[in-house]
């Protein structure tokens, strides 16, 4: 979760959020032929004590959470990050204007966890 | 980086930070026999545009960074999280006071990246 999110409210727990990314919005429409965009999703939310099972926390994240509670000024909470990512296939023009179909790994967030 | 770090400054780039964890500080000294603690380390820092090669960013993190630049209020920056974790061996007492040697996975941060 981002340092520029200065909410004074309690944030919700770490989870997957839906996000559709349009390649036109990214300015990639001239080289990506298809798709026009895709459901990329993203991870956000608190990794606070106790880290529940659905937070997919690593052993390190559990330890870091405990250390953060003891020493919050020097050690941050773990962060909410993708734990499962999927690929998408993209049809695009390469530098020589050839049409290429390529599978791009780690493009879609399927699950999030505390890391 | 953690949401509780409400920096109004630019933070340093995502990287590994050294952290020694004492099992006594965690209150685990009565069941963990050895080691007394270990170098757990942690990840912290900004995942800002552009994501350099040493930031070990996934394709999704690169896309999310661009979406964040367009829409910072709704989509956070990717977060700085472990990319490589190591195990440690722990000698401890189980519930029946037997001495057990067990390898705990994902306990030590070896490398960090933007996710």
């Amino acid at each position: 979760s981002a340092s520029d999110y200065n909410s004074s409210e309690l944030k919700t727990a770490c989870r997957k959020h839906e996000l559709y990314v349009s390649f036109q919005d990214l300015g990639w429409q001239d080289w990506i032929i298809a798709p026009k965009g895709y459901a990329a999703n993203y991870c956000d939310g608190e990794c606070s004590f106790p880290l529940n099972a659905h937070m997919n926390a690593t052993n390190h994240a559990i330890v870091q959470t405990l250390v953060h509670l003891m020493n919050p000024e020097y050690v941050p909470k773990p962060c909410c990050a993708p734990t499962k990512l999927n690929a998408i296939s993209v049809l695009y023009f390469d530098d020589n204007s050839n049409v290429i179909l390529k599978k791009y790994r780690n493009m879609v967030v399927r699950a999030c966890g505390c890391h | 980086s953690a949401s509780d770090y409400n920096s109004s400054e630019l933070k340093t780039a995502c990287r590994k930070h050294e952290l020694y964890v004492s099992f006594q500080d965690l209150g685990w000294q009565d069941w963990i026999i050895a080691p007394k603690g270990y170098a757990a380390n942690y990840c912290d820092g900004e995942c800002s545009f552009p994501l350099n090669a040493h930031m070990n960013a996934t394709n999704h993190a690169i896309v999310q960074t661009l979406v964040h630049l367009m829409n910072p209020e709704y989509v956070p920056k990717p977060c700085c999280a472990p990319t490589k974790l190591n195990a440690i061996s722990v000698l401890y007492f189980d519930d029946n006071s037997n001495v057990i040697l067990k390898k705990y996975r994902n306990m030590v941060v070896r490398a960090c990246g933007c996710h």
Epitope: L69, E73 | A2, D4, N6, S7, K11
Partner: antibody
Framework: QVQLVESGGGLVKPGGSLRLSCAAS????????VHWVRQAPGKGLEWVGR??????????SYAAPVKGRFTISRDDSKNTLYLQMNSLKTEDTAVYYC????????????WGQGTLVTVSS | QSVLTQPPSVSGAPGQRVTISCTGS?????????VHWYQQLPGTAPKLLIY???ERPSGVPDRFSGSKSGTSASLAITGLQAEDEADYYC???????????FGGGTKLTVL
């Protein structure tokens, strides 16, 4: 030994500005998180804000009553912490302390003697 | 109004035991954050008395002890002495932004 010495307090009119300094000695200032805490006359301690150290990009945070009016900064080469106070209000009248955060459990283990800021017309 | 609630005053005779409570909520003490205690003698700056719930910095007598349970913490002083007369503050963090929170302070009077 560890020492924190505040200076810069004084009398200022509402709406005015003041800059407080906290000179640190006896420890590696650049490795520590440091805070400002204030105490209005006859009242309790109130947290003002903090600056983290260089490893954390000097990240700053502020209490709601001072956000947007006060700015915390530090100069590690001079071992000095600053508090720039703008648009001062009468309710900002207080003794202002700087305090160091110890590195294992985050307690305020060393405090300055305090400097009095009086906001009055 | 302070985020952490302390009794405004407590008193005890020399040699007695007194306790000072500090009540928070699920977003601070109840979230698992450490609690620290400070002693402020009249006309002086606060001094760290107990850190990490129950640990004493060097130089602090073992008459002072701290504990924590659920959303509350407490400071106990045994064998009360005249020089213990001071204001006592608890401190923790709020989990929404890890901002520092203090109790309103408790004035200890030694009768």
């Amino acid at each position: 030994q560890v020492q924190l010495v505040e200076s810069g307090g004084g009398l200022v009119k509402p709406g005015g500005s003041l800059r407080l300094s906290c000179a640190a000695s006896g420890f590696t200032f650049s490795s520590y998180v440091v805070h400002w805490v204030r105490q209005a006359p006859g009242k309790g301690l109130e947290w003002v804000g903090r600056t983290r150290h260089s490893d954390m990009g000097y990240a700053t945070s502020y209490a709601a009553p001072v956000k947007g009016r006060f700015t915390i900064s530090r100069d590690d080469s001079k071992n000095t912490l600053y508090l720039q106070m703008n648009s001062l209000k009468t309710e900002d009248t207080a003794v202002y302390y700087c305090a160091r955060v110890e590195r294992s459990k985050s307690g305020f283990d060393n405090w300055g003697q305090g400097t009095l800021v009086t906001v009055s017309s | 109004q302070s985020v952490l609630t302390q009794p405004p005053s407590v008193s005890g005779a020399p040699g007695q035991r007194v306790t000072i409570s500090c009540t928070g909520s699920s977003s601070n003490i109840g979230a698992g954050y450490s609690v620290h205690w400070y002693q402020q003698l009249p006309g002086t700056a606060p001094k760290l008395l107990i850190y990490g719930q129950s640990e004493r910095p060097s130089g602090v007598p073992d008459r002072f002890s701290g504990s924590k349970s659920g959303t509350s913490a407490s400071l106990a002083i045994t064998g009360l002495q005249a020089e213990d007369e001071a204001d006592y503050y608890c401190q923790s963090w709020d989990s929404s932004q890890t901002l520092v929170v203090f109790g309103g302070g408790t004035k200890l009077t030694v009768l």
